[in-house]
């Protein structure tokens, strides 16, 4: 009787189970009656990922680098290129087809964590007794000066945008 | 249905060549293999090697592989094997078969090598 | 290469009787797949060869049950359970699972 169902790594084809062609490799002859399935090693600009029949390899990614592009880790047979952004610029999807500008933290909002080539910069308001006074991609909120460590008193208090004003203490007659 | 209709009898010198061709229809020409035979008088069959369509790819019997040359012409559907320097040993029936969801043979093509 | 031995050279047969018909290689037949790539053919007078069995027991479509095939490794043997008038021709065994792809001598099944 014909198969009607192949084990692991099979594929039925002619009512013949016939091996898949392992990573890196393409079909080039589906098995027969008298031959096993026939393979090729991908060429060095291809790859393929998994057992499969394709008769073609896929290209390799390309990092464009006037996308803003560069290569992180340079595919093989098996596994495809992987970009990643230049410095300075991150990528605008999961599988990174272009870059974009790390966006800065308003005053007000300091970076709580810095951004990678594949990550934006996450901001997060300063909160009471914090601020940030510039427009930047790397400042986490700031402290407000301690006026009393300085033997100094708060002449104008401090916002999420601005630092407090010490100023000397009233001397009392 | 699938066919391989091969050309007629073909008459050499010795050191002449021959080109026997083979037309496939009824299936997708460039999925399978085309396999070359040949079976001299009263003799049994020799394997000379096969081709693949799709790219061109070849597997030779090491005997073969020198004189015998195996192309296909993918428009028309038609596989060609060509023996060249002919011998009086070479006097056969040449079969193209293709195998793959059933065995087919073509007809068969006379070669005579004769002085 | 492999060297496919057939044997009986000759083989005259009683219609309705069976016969058997042996094929021995050089080494053995046995792939890396697991698969053996032992086949068995037919040759009637003035016709191309026709497949009876492929992979030492598995009968293409159309062949009558009576033809079988077994063995393993090196040792292989067809069968026929009852000769008909029609099975008269030139058996062959061939081996694809090395290259160059080989063949037996031939079998020639007569009626007595």
């Known amino acids: 009787e014909p198969p009607t169902a192949c084990r692991e790594k099979q594929y039925l084809i002619n009512s013949q189970c016939c091996s898949l062609c392992q990573p890196g490799q393409k079909l080039v002859s589906d098995c027969t009656e008298f031959t096993e399935t026939e393979c090729l090693p991908c060429s060095e600009s291809e790859f393929l990922d998994t057992w499969n029949r394709e008769t073609r390899c896929h290209q390799h990614k390309y990092c464009d680098p006037n996308l803003g592009l560069q290569v992180q880790q340079k595919g093989t047979s098996e596994t495809d290129t992987i970009c990643t952004c230049e410095e300075g610029l991150h990528c605008t999807s999961e599988s990174c087809e272009s870059c974009v500008p790390h966006r800065s933290c308003l005053p007000g909002f300091g970076v709580k964590q810095i951004a990678t080539g594949v990550s934006d910069t996450i901001c997060e308001p300063c909160p009471v007794g914090f601020f940030s006074n510039v427009s930047s991609a790397f400042e986490k909120c700031r402290p407000w000066t301690s006026c009393e460590t300085k033997d100094l008193v708060v002449q104008q208090a401090g916002t999420n945008k601005t630092d407090v004003v010490c100023g000397p203490q009233d001397r009392q007659r | 249905q699938v066919q391989l209709v091969q050309s007629g009898a073909e008459v050499k010198k010795p050191g002449a060549s021959v080109k026997v061709s083979c037309k496939a229809s009824?299936?997708?020409?460039?999925?399978?293999?085309i396999y070359w035979v040949r079976q001299a008088p009263g003799q049994g069959l020799e394997w000379i090697g096969g081709i693949n369509p799709r790219n061109g790819g070849t597997n030779f019997n090491e005997k073969f592989k020198s004189r015998a040359t195996l192309t296909v012409d993918t428009s028309i559907s038609t596989a060609y094997m060509e023996l060249s320097r002919l011998r009086s040993e070479d006097t056969a029936v040449y079969y193209c078969?293709?195998?793959?969801?059933?065995?087919?043979w073509g007809q068969g093509t006379t070669v005579t090598v004769s002085s | 290469d492999v060297v496919m031995t057939q044997s009986p050279l000759s083989l005259p047969v009683t219609l309705g009787d069976p016969a058997s018909i042996s094929c021995r290689s050089s080494?053995?037949?046995?792939?890396?797949?697991?698969?053996?790539?032992l086949h068995w053919y037919q040759q009637r007078p003035g016709q191309s060869p026709n497949h009876l069995i492929y992979q030492v027991s598995n009968r293409f479509s159309g062949v009558p049950d009576r033809f079988s095939g077994s063995g393993s490794g090196t040792d292989f043997t067809l069968k026929i359970s009852r000769v008909e008038a029609e099975d008269v021709g030139v058996y062959f065994c061939s081996q694809t699972t090395h290259v160059p792809w080989t063949f037996g001598g031939g079998t020639k099944l007569e009626i007595k």
């Open positions: 009824g299936y997708t020409f460039i999925s399978y293999y």
């Open positions: 080494q053995s037949l046995l792939h890396s797949n697991g698969n053996t790539y």
């Open positions: 078969t293709r195998h793959g969801n059933g065995v087919y």
